[in-house]
Interface confidence: medium
């Protein structure tokens, strides 16, 4: 019979004939054969995988560092990787969780909708149009655009959410 | 090297004040939001108080408003809080603080108690 070009789920193709995948928890050891399946062993305590694979080798747990404010919210299993939180009064600096700040800054183009209390991060907002914000900071709103016109002035260079407008003299050629 | 070397704290009474200072180096000081955090005794860190890079805009803790008063001096690189009308719960080792990340630069902060 012709070999397979595609193989059904939890499948996988190699060397003209289809092998199946590991199951979550579980990483290849050897392919399967014409005569033999594919060989699994389970991942070691501190790892994981979370998909069906054909990984050589399981990965590390999250390691959930103190020194950065983290602690372990989620014990890993060997499916599942660990879940890090942020000690109390602490906040994430991503979804990720990867460090801690006692409250976030927004970066630039974003201003503070609600500066942090004590047990609420601080809420940022993209600056709308007209507004800008051109520091990272866990206080500043977006700031208004310079209103060159008050000035009598006009603008050289529009203003975006991370800059504010350049005014400049109007044009006294014009008629 | 970025340093930060907080001084002012000691004893005081009750309705008294202090001023604490927050010597900076190792970074362009007048780049950066500065702040205030507190740890009272037994407790978790408080933020306190910030600035703004430029000193125009100031942020307090509902704990301190109408009471502390932060600034900077951009040309001395140091940061000041003036404490007035101090009770007793404002007892604590006062941090300034360069960001608010858990492991980014901090002081080693200065005790203040309140006491009579």
């Known amino acids: 019979p012709e070999p397979p070009t595609a193989c059904r789920e939890k499948q996988y193709l190699i060397n003209s004939q289809c092998c199946s995948l590991c199951q979550p928890g579980q990483k290849l050891v050897s392919d399967c054969t014409e005569f033999t399946e594919t060989e699994c062993l389970p991942c070691g305590e501190s790892e994981f995988l979370d998909t069906w694979n054909r990984e050589t080798h399981c990965h590390q747990h999250k390691y959930c560092d103190p020194n950065l404010g983290l602690r372990v919210q989620q014990k890993g299993t060997s499916e599942t990787d660990t879940i890090c939180t942020c000690e109390e009064g602490w906040h994430c600096t991503s979804e990720a969780c990867e460090s801690c700040v006692l409250h976030r800054s927004c970066s630039p183009g974003f201003g503070v909708k609600q500066i942090a209390t004590g047990v609420s991060d601080t809420i940022c907002e993209p600056c709308p149009v007209g507004f800008f914000s051109n520091v990272s900071s866990a206080f500043e709103k977006c700031h208004p655009w310079t209103s060159c016109e008050t000035k009598d002035l006009v603008v050289q260079q529009a203003g975006t959410n991370k800059t504010d407008v350049v005014c400049g003299p109007q044009d006294r050629l014009r008629a | 090297e970025v340093q930060l070397l907080e001084s002012g704290g000691g004893l005081v009474q009750p309705g008294g004040s202090l001023r604490l200072s927050c010597a900076a180096s190792?970074?362009?000081?007048?780049?950066?939001?500065m702040q205030w955090v507190r740890r009272a005794p037994g407790k978790g860190l408080e933020w306190v108080s910030a600035i703004s890079g430029d000193g125009y805009r100031t942020y307090y803790a509902d704990s301190v408003k109408g009471r502390f008063t932060i600034s900077r001096d951009n040309s001395k690189n140091t940061l000041y809080l003036q404490m007035n009308s101090l009770r007793a719960e404002d007892t604590a080792v006062y941090y300034c603080?360069?960001?608010?990340?858990?492991?980014?630069?901090w002081g080693r902060g200065t005790l203040v108690t309140v006491s009579s």
């Open positions: 603080a360069k960001e608010l990340a858990f492991f980014d630069y």
């Open positions: 190792g970074f362009t000081f007048e780049w950066y939001e």
